[in-house]
């Protein structure tokens, strides 16, 4: 649900702060980065949309990327821009809208939303359909014909959650984003009430699974409100969650 996407990501093992902008209510991943928010402009009207400053693509919504608003503009002044549709020019995968990736400077359709298709295509061009190996170690010859037709498994690099198999989401790990398991009932999550207060986060948990939301654990009382343990819990039928 929207609420669980908003609230259920937890980060740990932080390195020393490295800077970064504050969270953006419309972003897929916060500027920290680490907290998933509802995706991009689709929850905002054009009238109230305001350019959001960013440093990296993942600080923007799923339908946005981070760049200077003017061609050849100051790289220090970047904002979240609308993603580019098929056949539009691009420089990296995140510039292309979901379901596409950047190949040879143009946004092209991904196979099964697999945004790394460029690598597999390179292999097909180089080796054709011959999947034999010379010494058992010509590892690039079979750069995963199976991966090309399936979504990312646990630990696979991803750009968006749609790149991952069912039950997984795309979340930050170190300096990349990988497919990780969606949280199950009882698993720890972190509910960030104040956006932009979480510092730089490089280990990110998925959101809570279907029918679950990130809520404070009952009978877990601590002096500090901010340090209370949150877990993925079943929705109460009589209880509804709303955004603030």
């Amino acid at each position: 649900t929207l609420n669980s996407v908003l609230n259920s990501n937890a980060i740990k093992n932080l390195p020393p702060p490295l800077g970064g902008a504050a969270g953006h209510p419309g972003s897929a991943v916060s500027a920290a980065p680490g907290i998933l928010y509802p995706g991009g402009n689709k929850y905002q009207t054009i009238d109230n949309y305001q350019p959001y400053p960013c440093a990296e693509d993942e600080e923007c919504g799923t339908d946005e990327y981070c760049a200077s608003p003017t061609r050849g503009g100051d790289a220090g002044v970047q904002i979240c821009l609308a993603c580019r549709k098929r056949r539009k020019r691009c420089m990296r995968h995140a510039m292309c809208c979901p379901g596409n990736y950047c190949k040879n400077g143009i946004c092209v359709s991904s196979d099964q939303n697999h945004f790394r298709g460029e690598i597999e295509e390179t292999i097909t061009e180089s080796f054709g359909n011959d999947h034999s190996t010379l010494d058992g170690y010509s590892r690039r010859t079979t750069l995963s014909s199976k991966m090309y037709h399936t979504k990312g498994q646990e630990g696979s690099v991803c750009l968006r959650s749609s790149d991952c198999a069912s039950g997984l989401c795309c979340a930050r790990h170190f300096w990349s984003k990988i497919c990780k398991p969606v949280l199950k009932e009882g698993q720890v999550c972190t509910k960030h009430r104040r956006k932009g207060s979480h510092g730089l986060e490089i280990f990110q948990r998925c959101y809570c699974g279907e029918g679950l939301s990130c809520r404070i654990q009952k009978d877990h009382h601590q002096a500090s409100n901010s340090s209370r343990l949150h877990t993925c819990q079943r929705h109460h039928h009589h209880h509804h969650h709303h955004h603030h």
Epitope: A94, M147, G155, F174, W175
Partner: antibody, heavy 117, light 111 residues
């Protein structure tokens, strides 16, 4: 074909500086994080620095303040500026990236840095 | 930081034999439902090559004779039947925490 080619290694005196380069090809360079990993003669592997696709940088304490990792996405190039070099920085320096999974799944062949007087 | 200890330091075996390499972490490398343990092979004068990631998943194009297992702090790399090209040094690496760290290596040599 994915390729990473390092250059810039050489002999330098303690306290000196050196700039390593890594030329990447065969993938959309600007979309991926990339790292430097080193290996001292006869020793194991040690992570040196990483930079995300968006340019955020990460270092271990052993090189923080002395080494600077950077990237030029327009040139498909990665750099490592090494200052205040010490004898213990002597190693083969590899650039490595993570294209398919979170591990270092593609490596260059390395460039040798020797710090000696 | 997480310290990885590999054993044995050297393993002397003949082609066709089974090799079992061990890696022990100073603390659990499991998180987010994944064991963040990787294995690499390195031959003299060459760069490391990824064999196994997430404890048991094979890297691209890696022969089926290489398999990984384990969780928490104890991990194993198994080569079911050694080929002549398998004699090399093998490193484990954890990616649960910054800094990512490597084990000291196990050399698999011809008996």
């Amino acid at each position: 074909e994915v390729q990473l080619v390092e250059s810039g290694g050489g002999l330098v005196q303690p306290g000196g500086s050196l700039r390593l380069s890594c030329a990447a090809s065969g993938f959309t360079f600007s979309s991926y994080a990339i790292s430097w990993v080193r290996q001292a003669p006869g020793k194991g592997l040690e992570w040196v620095a990483s930079v995300s696709g968006g340019g955020r940088t990460y270092y271990p304490d052993s090189v923080k303040g002395r080494f600077t990792i950077s990237r030029d996405n327009a040139k498909n190039s990665l750099y490592l500026q090494m200052n205040s070099l010490r004898a213990e920085d002597t190693a083969v320096y590899y650039c490595a990236t993570s294209l398919e999974n979170y591990a270092f799944d593609y490596w260059g062949q390395g460039t040798t840095v020797t710090v000696s007087s | 930081e997480i310290v990885l200890t590999q054993s044995p330091a050297t393993l002397s075996l003949s082609p066709g034999e089974r090799a079992t390499l061990s890696c022990r972490a100073s603390e659990s490398v499991d998180d987010f439902g994944i064991s963040f343990m990787n294995w690499y092979q390195q031959k003299p004068g060459q760069a490391p090559r990824l064999l196994i990631y997430a404890a048991s998943k094979q890297g691209s194009g890696i022969p089926a004779r290489f398999s990984g297992s384990g969780s928490g702090t104890d991990f194993t790399l198994t080569i079911s039947s050694l080929e002549p090209e398998d004699f090399a040094v093998y490193y484990c690496q954890q990616a649960k925490e910054v800094p990512p760290t490597f084990g000291g290596g196990t050399k698999v040599e011809i008996k």
